[in-house]
């Protein structure tokens, strides 16, 4: 898996999307975890509803929320009130038994609030980027 970069502005919300094959991962709950070091474990932040059929319901842990479109095959994670300490490597995961398959590796980058430095009319709202070491999305 290559890494996809998502950039967000400090204090704002950032939405991370993880597409997947909806049939391949049918019936599987999903999770969002934070990578602890390059080779370290991925620490679970939040997972979808315990009942897969209710995966569309938003679940929250602190400022992080997760919801799963199991038909369309898109897992969405929302990080509210983005802070510098939120920056780092994460993974979207598909769960089966105690195993977790990586759906997407993500690098979250937190940018300084542009309103501190420029006129709001020049505001650029960042989102998904493909610039990280020639990163590309693997389906």
């Amino acid at each position: 898996h290559n890494t996809t970069v998502f950039q967000g502005v400090e204090g704002q919300s950032l939405q991370v999307s993880c597409p997947y094959d909806s049939m391949k991962h049918w019936g599987r709950r999903k999770a969002w975890c934070r990578q602890l070091g390059e080779k370290g474990p991925c620490q679970r932040v939040v997972s979808t509803h315990n009942l897969w059929l209710l995966s569309f319901l938003r679940r929250r842990n602190g400022s992080t929320a997760i919801t799963d479109d199991t038909l369309g095959g898109t897992l969405t994670i929302t990080l509210r009130n983005l802070q510098p300490h939120d920056a780092g490597f994460y993974q979207c995961q598909s769960l089966h038994g105690s195993e977790a398959d990586t759906l997407r590796k993500v690098l979250v980058e937190v940018l300084a609030d542009p309103l501190d430095h420029r006129d709001a009319g020049d505001l650029w709202v960042p989102g998904e980027s493909e610039s990280f070491e020639d990163a590309h999305v693997e389906h």
Epitope: M23, G27, R28, H96, G97, S98
Partner: antibody, heavy 123, light 107 residues
């Protein structure tokens, strides 16, 4: 009706190559993982590995990694198990099985099985 | 790998008897366990999944229970067609592993 139909029994000599097959019908073959399971004479069941025919994603048991190759041809709804150099210890019955995820607990179980292919390796 | 240990390895019983087979995992596997029935020369057949859920078409005399490391398959009233070998299988982690089997014979 869901069916997995395996190729017929094989008798081979040590060192020979072999490819056995498992053809699925009655369901969307590309939407379910297929597992291969070995049963040596009079023994229990051993999980060898799985493949997702939709994209050929494959996982092997460490015990079988490098010993066999699992593949699939989704255009003809068929999964394969192959050996490049058979050994006498490969003599066994080989089953393919459809792996189904039950959403109650988000894990996978084998709900349909092929009839088995008996492989005999003897000089 | 998770080791699955079944007991007894064989059991003799009569039609109408209640039979219990146990399966122990070498580490906790939550409720990620299945039970299969295999008759001579045939493929295994899924009976129970998720430790206690009955597979479609399987008679209600079969039931499963347990979680963590200890699991049980119970046949409430043995029928002639139930004499076979039974295997447990963990679906917790790779590689998937099976118990060594319990052969149910006619007394």
């Amino acid at each position: 009706e869901v069916q997995l139909v395996q190729s017929g029994a094989e008798v081979k000599k040590p060192g020979e190559s072999l490819k056995i097959s498992c053809k699925g019908s009655g369901y969307s073959f590309t939407s379910y993982w297929i597992a291969w399971v070995r049963q040596m004479p009079g023994k229990g069941l051993e999980w060898m590995g799985i493949i997702y025919p939709g994209d050929s994603d494959t996982r092997y048991s460490p015990s079988f990694q490098g010993q066999v190759t699992i593949s699939a041809d989704k255009s003809i709804s068929t999964a394969y198990l192959q050996w490049s150099s058979l050994k006498a210890s490969d003599t066994a019955m080989y089953f393919c099985a459809r792996q189904r995820t039950f959403y109650y607990d988000s894990s996978d179980y084998f709900d349909y099985w092929g009839q088995g292919t008996l492989v005999t390796v003897s000089s | 790998d998770i080791q699955m240990t079944q007991s007894p390895s064989s059991v003799s019983a009569s039609v109408g008897d209640r039979v219990t087979i146990t399966c122990r995992a070498s580490q906790g596997i939550s409720s990620w366990l299945a039970w299969y029935q295999q008759k001579p020369g045939k493929a295994p057949k899924l009976l129970i999944y998720a430790a206690s859920s009955l597979q479609n078409g399987v008679p209600s005399r079969f039931s499963g229970s347990g979680s963590g490391t200890d699991f049980t398959l119970t046949i409430s009233s043995l029928q002639p067609e139930d004499f076979a070998t039974y295997f447990c299988q963990q679906a917790d982690s790779f590689p998937r592993t099976f118990g060594q089997g319990t052969k149910l014979e006619i007394k």
